[in-house]
């Protein structure tokens, strides 16, 4: 039996700059029941607070609701482990909510097969930003990627679309069913998960790719 090992805050994420969650790895428990608490202070303040919500985001986590989240302040967060033999603390982690945003995937992915005047066919891919994202006001600047592949293929073909919420894909194989997904990333944050797949079958009635 021994004091607990040092815990580690291994991830903090916000879906929208309005709430966020931090998760920790407990470390060894020293063979004894061990209690974990997350404490934090904010830049320029001496007061230390305890995690407002240990439940919402699951085990070994702390959820900060709107009431406790500010993008104007740095959070200095520590996890403390305590058992009968002693205690240990994680290294403090400095969290700027601007830099931990991982949004929901884009919505309303639509696929349309179109034809140019010269009979060249292309796939027009369109989507909407995630619901929670206030892109119009500049609160978020979002970048996007799409990926697509023939249904049976292993490898995805990825296209970065910048800030555009639509993209035209040329030179696809006729008669093939294609799977398409999209994802987004805010200016300083992390890529979202890929959206659910949408599929489309390219028509047969145009010239085959070389």
């Amino acid at each position: 039996q021994s004091p607990p090992g040092k815990p580690e805050i291994h991830k903090c994420r916000s879906p929208d700059k309005e709430t966020f969650t931090c998760w920790w790895n407990p470390g060894t428990d020293g063979g004894l029941p061990t209690n974990y608490s997350l404490t934090y202070s904010k830049e320029g303040e001496k007061t230390t607070y305890e995690c407002p919500d240990y439940k919402t985001s699951g085990p070994n986590s702390c959820f900060f609701s709107k009431q406790y989240t500010s993008i104007w302040k740095i959070y200095i967060i520590t996890v403390n482990a305590t058992n009968q033999m002693g205690s240990s603390s994680s290294d403090p982690l400095y969290v700027d909510v601007t830099y931990i945003v991982e949004p929901e995937p884009p919505r309303n992915l639509t696929l349309e097969v179109k034809q140019l005047k010269d009979k060249k066919t292309y796939l027009w891919v369109k989507w909407s930003p995630p619901t929670i994202t206030d892109v119009k006001t500049g609160w978020f600047t979002m970048e996007y990627e799409i990926r697509l592949k023939p249904e049976e293929a292993e490898e995805w073909e990825i296209h970065f679309t910048g800030h555009q919420t639509q993209f035209k894909v040329f030179d696809l194989y006729p008669g093939q069913k294609y799977l398409v997904q999209t994802r987004c990333k805010p200016d300083h944050g992390y890529w979202s998960r890929w959206s659910q797949e949408s599929s489309v079958e390219m028509p047969n009635d145009f010239t085959l790719k070389d």
Epitope: E8, H10, W72, D91, Y94, V95, D96, T98
Partner: antibody, heavy 118, light 112 residues
């Protein structure tokens, strides 16, 4: 505790390339971006670029595009920077540095001195 | 790129005196989120830099309170209220509001 280990020095010939390593320990490697910074002898610091080890997404200082390539090996928790077509201007100390979830550098490697000499 | 101009290049001081280092940016360092990402680092010979102050005025963990930062917009100052022997090192300001992140040229604090 968080540690970033870098080799002390590399001596390389002009026109060749070098791959610098930065082995991370004491934290979850894929959770934090890794930056690279250049310091020429007796001079200031220059930010080269950053890589997100979770998906290898990179962002470079325009000045170093084509010169530096950032990669990671998540299984060994190691970040790499490949420098190509080396000239005397590339002789410098190169640091890897990690922020927290913030945009400053909390942890630094000890730096690798790259000397480009015939 | 944002140019960070530090003055003076070298600052002779007596132990116990106050030292003041200035840093000026070529454009405003106020981020679109309202924060100002101006930081100060200290570097000892043969070592990597260490963070002293983040976001203009916040002392990093373990930094003595004789170090303080101030300023806004494009003009910033690092003050050391009572210089000690261990403070006679190289200081850099740095901005991370705009990509690429940039650094000042450095100020060497030395004994008068």
């Amino acid at each position: 505790q968080v540690q970033l280990q870098q080799p002390g020095a590399e001596l390389v010939r002009p026109g060749t390339s070098v791959k610098l390593s930065c082995k991370a320990s004491g934290y979850t490697f894929t959770s934090f971006w890794m930056h690279w910074v250049k310091q020429r002898p007796g001079q200031g610091l220059e930010w080269i670029g950053v890589i997100d080890p979770s998906d290898s997404h990179t962002n470079y200082n325009q000045k170093f595009k084509g010169k530096a390539t950032l990669t990671v090996n998540t299984s060994s928790s190691t970040a790499y920077m490949h420098l190509s077509s080396l000239t005397s201007e590339d002789s410098a100390v190169y640091y890897c540095a990690r922020g927290d979830y913030s945009n400053w550098f909390t942890y630094w490697g000890q730096g690798t001195l790259v000397t480009v000499s015939a | 790129d944002v140019v960070m101009t530090q003055t003076p290049f070298s600052l002779p001081v007596s132990l116990g005196d106050q030292a003041s280092i200035s840093c000026r940016s070529s454009q405003s360092l106020v981020h679109s989120n309202g924060n100002t990402y101006l930081h100060w680092y200290l570097q000892k010979p043969g070592q990597s830099p260490k963070l002293l102050i983040y976001k203009v005025s916040n002392r990093f963990s373990g930094v003595p309170d004789r170090f303080s930062g101030s300023g806004s917009g494009t003009d910033f100052t690092l003050k050391i209220s009572r210089v000690e022997a261990e403070d006679l090192e190289l200081y850099f300001c740095s901005q991370s509001t705009h990509v690429p992140w940039t650094f000042g040229g450095g100020t060497k604090l030395e004994i008068k």
